[in-house]
């Protein structure tokens, strides 16, 4: 349905509060270095303009597209050239090229200071002094650091952020009330950002078909009682929502997501029995709840798939008539029967089935050729099962920190060219799979673990894409979305790597380490471990363990010393010498 004024349409659909919040998110995700005040000014100008269009849709410029209006506004920023360099060249382009240009300049790892959490009393005062500015600042800071954050979901986070301050700033012990809530929001926010980043990478790097396949598999697991036609409709709508959000069309995305939630709730009887509670919630909570809803029970009586997909004489006829529909049905039928498989495994099985049909439907005797197609599934299923079993055993034996260290060593040896901060961040996140997934029963382990690993490895891929340093990473990241994890798992030690020169400065520590939180101290130690492996890639586990144990003892000893700085200086020299000797450097 065409509207005379798109901006007026979205303003009316979303309401002023959501409109302003979404425009702020959009601008902060595009111009990540701009000061908060500049963004607020731009948002206010856009909002005032939108209001004039609501009053009269025929008013001047109200018929312009949102990309044109927003792009024109962003291009009025005076310091664009000096702050963003070549991104300023985007402003010389016309839509839609200008928006594509802005999208290409989104930075997954912007050079922004770490967010430091002020004292609780300081935060509560700021919250009470100006609640609106305080919440806008939250949206701005998250959006600029996470330029692909799912905007309607960020509104949900902001709502929870506000609720936490409203409740806790009145509590007797403000800190005890607030800090755990903020920690939870931070951790959930990072996870949400990473999950959305994978969706956008899937759409942008591998195309709509790849995303739709992922969505068919996931929604079929979640809604196994829904008909294929219903799942297909949901997949189409969901693809539109994520295409819009990943493309910077945040107003349309939020509006369409609300429509999708409405549709799901109006049709829950034909979708899932698990939606009742979600559908009683307000909009933001409802959409979040639907996105996280547990899998419905499988229908009581699902036949074997062999009849339709192997034994039927019409397999090649059905495939030829509508390849993607037939493959979609295969994926739907397999996924609804297999909530115990990861989505990426289901997609590998579907790809194997597709490849077999492509080959066999051109053969002399197609049926004879594809009769044994599912024998090819067995190794594909067993590989992640075995990998998860081995790694969960290792995790249970070592605990999270040491399990992360094992992964740090493993991945540094595979791709030593990758920057140390990236290796530390990615390996720490890979290591979290243990506490996240190994506690689950076997039927839930694989979807938990392998789909989580896909999200984490995508972080490695997008960070590496910014400054590519390893052909092996590029190869694993670009060849196949669903085979990224097996590709990285299969990498052995990089024999072509020339060890890094030893630099004593890398292993010089100071008394400030003593005041760090346990997590930050772990990161320091893990950074040192990566550097050790880069210096001595052939070091054995035993050698590395000995050096790390010495390092831990050194930190503990000097943090207890009266003159900490002297201790770090003197004992540090001894430690470096001992480590060099132990590793034969």
């Amino acid at each position: 349905d065409a509207h005379k004024s798109e901006v007026a349409h979205r303003f009316k659909d979303l309401g002023e509060e959501n409109f302003k919040a979404l425009v702020l998110i959009a601008f902060a995700q595009y111009l990540q270095q701009c000061p908060f005040e500049d963004h607020v000014k731009l948002v206010n100008e856009v909002t005032e303009f939108a209001k004039t269009c609501v009053a009269d849709e025929s008013a001047e410029n109200c018929d312009k597209s949102l990309h044109t209006l927003f792009g024109d506004k962003l291009c009025t920023v005076a310091t664009l050239r000096e702050t963003y360099g070549e991104m300023a060249d985007c402003c010389a382009k016309q839509e839609p090229e200008r928006n594509e240009c802005f999208l290409q300049h989104k930075d997954d790892n912007p050079n922004l200071p770490r967010l430091v959490r002020p004292e609780v009393d300081v935060m509560c005062t700021a919250f009470h002094d100006n609640e609106e500015t305080f919440l806008k600042k939250y949206l701005y800071e998250i959006a600029r650091r996470h330029p692909y954050f799912y905007a309607p979901e960020l509104l949900f986070f902001a709502k929870r952020y506000k609720a936490a301050f409203t409740e806790c700033c009145q509590a007797a012990d403000k800190a005890a009330c607030l800090l755990p809530k903020l920690d939870e929001l931070r951790d959930e926010g990072k996870a949400s950002s990473a999950k959305q980043r994978l969706k956008c990478a899937s759409l942008q790097k591998f195309g709509e078909r790849a995303f739709k396949a992922w969505a068919v598999a996931r929604l079929s697991q979640r809604f196994p009682k829904a008909e294929f036609a219903e799942v297909s409709k949901l997949v189409t709508d969901l693809t539109k929502v994520h295409t819009e959000c990943c493309h910077g069309d945040l107003l349309e995305c939020a509006d369409d997501r609300a429509d999708l939630a409405k549709y799901i709730c109006e049709n829950q009887d034909s979708i899932s029995s698990k939606l009742k509670e979600c559908c009683e919630k307000p909009l933001l909570e409802k959409s979040h709840c639907i996105a996280e809803v547990e899998n419905d029970e499988m229908p009581a009586d699902l036949p074997s798939l062999a009849a339709d997909f192997v034994e039927s004489k019409d397999v090649c006829k059905n495939y030829a008539e509508a390849k993607d529909v037939f493959l979609g049905m295969f994926l739907y039928e397999y996924a609804r029967r297999h909530p115990d498989y990861s989505v990426v495994l289901l997609l590998r099985l579907a790809k194997t089935y597709e490849t077999t049909l492509e080959k066999c439907c051109a053969a002399a005797d197609p049926h004879e050729c594809y009769a044994k197609v599912f024998d090819e599934f067995k190794p594909l299923v067993e590989e992640p099962q075995n990998l998860i079993k081995q790694n969960c055993e290792l995790f249970e034996q070592l605990g999270e920190y040491k399990f992360q260290n094992a992964l740090l060593v493993r991945y540094t040896k595979k791709v030593p060219q990758v920057s140390t901060p990236t290796l530390v961040e990615v390996s720490r996140n890979l290591g979290k799979v243990g506490s996240k997934c190994c506690k689950h029963p076997e039927a839930k382990r694989m979807p938990c673990a392998e789909d989580y690993l896909s999200v984490v490895l995508n972080q490695l891929c997008v960070l590496h894409e910014k400054t590519p340093v390893s052909d092996r990473v590029t190869k694993c990241c670009t060849e196949s979305l669903v085979n990224r994890r097996p590709c990285f798992s299969a990498l052995e030690v990089d024999e072509t790597y020339v060890p890094k020169e030893f630099n004593a400065e890398t292993f010089t520590f100071h008394a400030d380490i003593c005041t760090l939180s346990e997590k930050e101290r772990q990161i320091k130690k893990q950074t040192a471990l990566v550097e050790l492996v880069k210096h001595k890639p052939k070091a054995t586990k035993e050698q590395l363990k000995a050096v790390m144990d010495d390092f831990a003892a050194f930190v503990e000893k000097c943090c207890k010393a009266d003159d900490k700085e002297t201790c770090f200086a003197e004992e540090g020299k001894k430690l470096v010498a001992a480590s060099q000797a132990a590793l034969g450097l």
Epitope: M298, A300, L302, L305, E333, R337, H338, P339, E382
Partner: nanobody
Framework: EVQLVESGGGVVQPGGSLRLSCAAS????????MGWFRRAPGKEREFVAA????????YYADSVKGRFTISRDNSKKTAYLQMNSLRPEDTALYYC?????????????????WGQGTLVTVSS
């Protein structure tokens, strides 16, 4: 957790019949596809028959179609394999299996729980 115990095996002449039973304890078997597999001496384990959760769908290996019938009684937590017109090549150790998420009924890796087996010998 499901424990499966097969019974009903024995020695029978060619052309004879046997009825195998698979009794489950632990979980309710109505959530599981039930299957029968067999392993003949010196051979790989092979699929025989399977039945969907409520019993509405059955699926057979070509070699037993028309001779064997699989059934189940969820209230008794038991699956059955009625074997008629038995042949010497049906001689094998017969295993019962339960699969929570089976899509391909004939694939052994899609079954989560297995019994110890019951021996069927067809000989004159």
């Amino acid at each position: 957790e499901v424990q499966l115990v097969e019974s009903g095996g024995g020695v029978v002449q060619p052309g004879g019949s046997l009825r195998l039973s698979c009794a489950a304890s632990g979980s309710n078997i109505s959530s599981y596809v039930m299957g029968w597999f067999r392993r003949a001496p010196g051979k790989e384990r092979e699929f025989v028959a399977a039945i969907s959760r409520s019993g509405g769908y059955t699926y057979y290996a070509d070699s037993v179609k028309g001779r064997f019938t699989i059934s189940r009684d969820n209230s008794k937590k038991t699956a059955y394999l009625q074997m008629n017109s038995l042949r010497p090549e049906d001689t094998a150790l017969y295993y019962c299996a339960a699969g929570r998420y089976s899509a391909w009924y004939s694939q052994s890796y899609e079954y989560d729980y297995w019994g110890q087996g019951t021996l069927v010998t067809v000989s004159s």
